[in-house]
């Protein structure tokens, strides 16, 4: 999937299986990614688990779990708030669109989470105070916390290089992260579909084009569109909303 | 200790939670304050040793004198609240200040810096 980190880095990751997205003293978010096509390096999120940890007199531990075709509007125990404590209503789930869009407000940690199902796959967006982001007991364990550190270099897909190949008239299959590129989806059509929803040619737009060329699934246009919309709602600095491609960073740097 | 329930009922009754009601709202504000005072008095047995209780008591006294409210007089009716959906546990569900990050944060420093993370597509 495409990842926008807390530090506004934008990456395309091939991380497959279960990975920690957020892991701090207050909450734990884990995603499970699966290949979008057989043999493809590109993956999308098929499962999401959020654990809100027990917190003072505010909330009991609550688990939220979403999977493909199952976006619940309640925690795993059936409740919609933080339990029986005084401040239980400082954690609330709101169903925005049945089966498609859920918002979780965790006021006790100043955090808002948006989970969507777009097509077959899930999207995730969060707004969180820096103080909460950095509230980690064991700093050594932060290594694979994707939202903070990004994905490891060996798990990144260079979709800018992929795009350069896609733009050239001949598109050798080897340049693609997927050996099964749907030939029915020409580059020009992908660009047009993405332009329709994402007029600014930023990295969300580039991600949209990449996804259409990789999968041929138009739902990924909406995924990129909603990711940008959620960013508009959740990002505190509106000037930083649109990210544009930079020159590639040196290996070892967080990309 | 249910002092937090008193607090939230008072804020709910005074709508915007404003400490400075318009002059024509003062009688209503005083009624809400008297209701708040009655509510805190009822919690004294179980809250008297806790900070939240004493903060409420002193806060009420200050507001009473600021708005020249008499100790005796009408009290306000609590607002009718829609019931939570069945199955939701709403026991002890008032929100203390510690359960509102922004409120407790503002007490100590400027507004918090927010960050954003997103994951989507393939």
């Amino acid at each position: 999937p495409h990842l926008r980190t807390f530090t506004d880095h934008f990456q395309t990751c091939k991380v497959q299986g279960a990975w920690p997205l957020i892991d701090n003293n207050y909450l734990n978010v884990q995603v499970t990614n699966t290949p979008v096509l057989p043999g493809s390096a590109a993956t999308a999120t098929s499962k999401l688990t959020i654990i809100f940890k027990n917190f003072q007199e505010c909330v009991d531990q609550k688990v939220y779990q979403a999977e493909m075709d199952e976006l619940p509007s309640a925690f795993a125990d059936g409740s919609k708030n933080g339990g029986d404590k005084h401040g239980a209503n400082s954690l609330k789930i709101t169903e925005k669109v049945s089966g498609q869009h859920v918002e979780i407000q965790a006021k006790y940690i100043g955090t808002t989470i948006v989970v969507r199902q777009v097509g077959r796959y899930l999207t995730f967006a969060v707004r969180m105070p820096e103080e909460v982001v950095n509230a980690v007991e064991d700093r050594d364990s932060q290594g694979l916390y994707l939202c903070l550190r990004g994905c490891p270099l060996n798990q990144q897909i260079d979709f800018q290089a992929f795009r350069a190949n896609a733009e050239s008239p001949r598109r050798p299959a080897a340049a693609s992260p997927s050996p099964v590129v749907p030939e029915t989806f020409p580059y020009e059509t992908a660009v047009a579909k993405c332009k329709e929803k994402l007029p600014v040619e930023d990295l969300y737009y580039q991600a949209c084009v990449f996804d259409l060329l990789t999968t041929g699934d138009v739902n990924f246009t909406l995924a990129a569109y909603y990711a940008l919309e959620d960013g508009k709602m959740l990002h505190s600095n509106k000037d930083k909303l649109h990210l544009f491609e930079r020159t590639r960073e040196l290996p070892g740097a967080v990309a | 200790c249910k002092i937090l329930k008193c607090n939230s009922e008072f804020w709910s009754a005074t709508s915007s939670g404003s400490h400075a009601p318009a002059s024509d709202d003062v009688p209503e504000f005083c009624a809400a304050l008297r209701t708040y005072a009655l509510c805190t008095r009822r919690t004294a047995r179980t809250c008297r040793g806790d900070l939240a209780y004493h903060s409420a008591v002193h806060g009420i006294e200050d507001l009473m004198s600021q708005h020249n409210c008499s100790k005796d007089g009408p009290t306000s009716q609590p607002r009718v609240r829609t019931l939570p959906p069945a199955g939701d546990s709403q026991e002890r569900s008032d929100s203390p200040e510690i359960c509102h990050y922004e409120k407790s944060f503002h007490k100590h420093s400027a507004a918090p810096n927010y960050t954003h993370c997103g994951l989507f597509g393939d």
């Epitope: - | 200790c1 008095r41 047995r45 179980t46 008297r48 040793g49 806790d50 900070l51 004493h54």
Partner: antibody, heavy 115, light 112 residues
Framework: EVQLVESGGGLVQPGGSLRLSCAAS????????MNWIRQAPGKGLEWIGM????????HYADSVKGRFTISRDNSKNTLYLQMNSLRAEDTAVYYC????????WGQGTMVTVSS | DVVLTQSPLSLPVTLGQPASISCRSS???????????LEWFQQRPGQSPRLLIY???SRFSGVPDRFSGSGSGTDFTLKISRVEAEDVGVYYC?????????FGQGTKLEIK
């Protein structure tokens, strides 16, 4: 998670003194009144006393008045029970508990008064 | 001081069956405002007491809904709808309406 850990118990002779501590975590200690409660071996529970959040007031059971003193150090998140002129009937497990009305309790510390 | 008298002192129950414990107060626990401050605690073997019910009938955080409290004035009851193995222990009522705070003598629940 609310945690209360008592310490300082042990064997003491009648007439002797002992100071118990209760280390609190998982909640804002300085916001709450705190209680001490005891339980003699094989017996029921007996309230000893309570202290307000800011130490402004303390209340004691008649059985310990004048002999026991409750105090607290909010900067250390710690509650204390100073026990003087101890008697055999003070032998018990001593618990600290959070809140004006006790809701969360510690695991207790045993005090044995015997010659 | 207010005296709380619990009955029975010992309660053998079959797993899955209901159980009921009574707590009687030597004077009314209702305040002039109509509030009643009576709590119930559970003490499992070798553990410290745990709050189950506060203000007669409100379940505390994390307490299973098979526990319920009722009563008014001087007569109060704790009910367990279906006893489970983990419910074994001593149950105490406690009043906070009058100073000093006092406890009942305890009811020992055991499995038949």
């Amino acid at each position: 998670e609310v945690q209360l850990v008592e310490s300082g118990g042990g064997l003491v002779q009648p007439g002797g003194s002992l100071r118990l501590s209760c280390a609190a975590s998982g909640f804002t200690f300085s916001n709450y009144g705190m209680n001490w409660i005891r339980q003699a071996p094989g017996k029921g529970l007996e309230w000893i006393g309570m202290i307000y959040y800011d130490s402004s007031e303390k209340h004691y059971a008649d059985s310990v008045k004048g002999r026991f003193t409750i105090s607290r150090d909010n900067s250390k998140n710690t509650l204390y029970l100073q026990m003087n002129s101890l008697r055999a009937e003070d032998t018990a497990v001593y618990y600290c508990a959070k809140g004006t009305t006790p809701d969360y309790w510690g695991q207790g510390t045993m005090v044995t008064v015997s010659s | 001081d207010v005296v709380l008298t619990q009955s029975p002192l010992s309660l053998p129950v079959t797993l899955g069956q209901p159980a009921s414990i009574s707590c009687r107060s030597s004077q009314s626990l209702e305040t002039s405002d109509g509030d009643t401050f009576l709590e119930w605690f559970q003490q499992r073997p070798g553990q410290s007491p745990r709050l189950l019910i506060y203000e007669v009938s409100s379940r505390f955080s994390g307490v299973p809904d098979r526990f319920s409290g009722s009563g008014s004035g001087t007569d109060f009851t704790l009910k367990i709808s279906r006893v489970e193995a983990e419910d074994v222990g001593v149950y105490y009522c406690m009043q906070v309406t009058h100073d000093p705070l006092t406890f009942g003598q305890g009811t020992k629940l055991e499995i038949k």
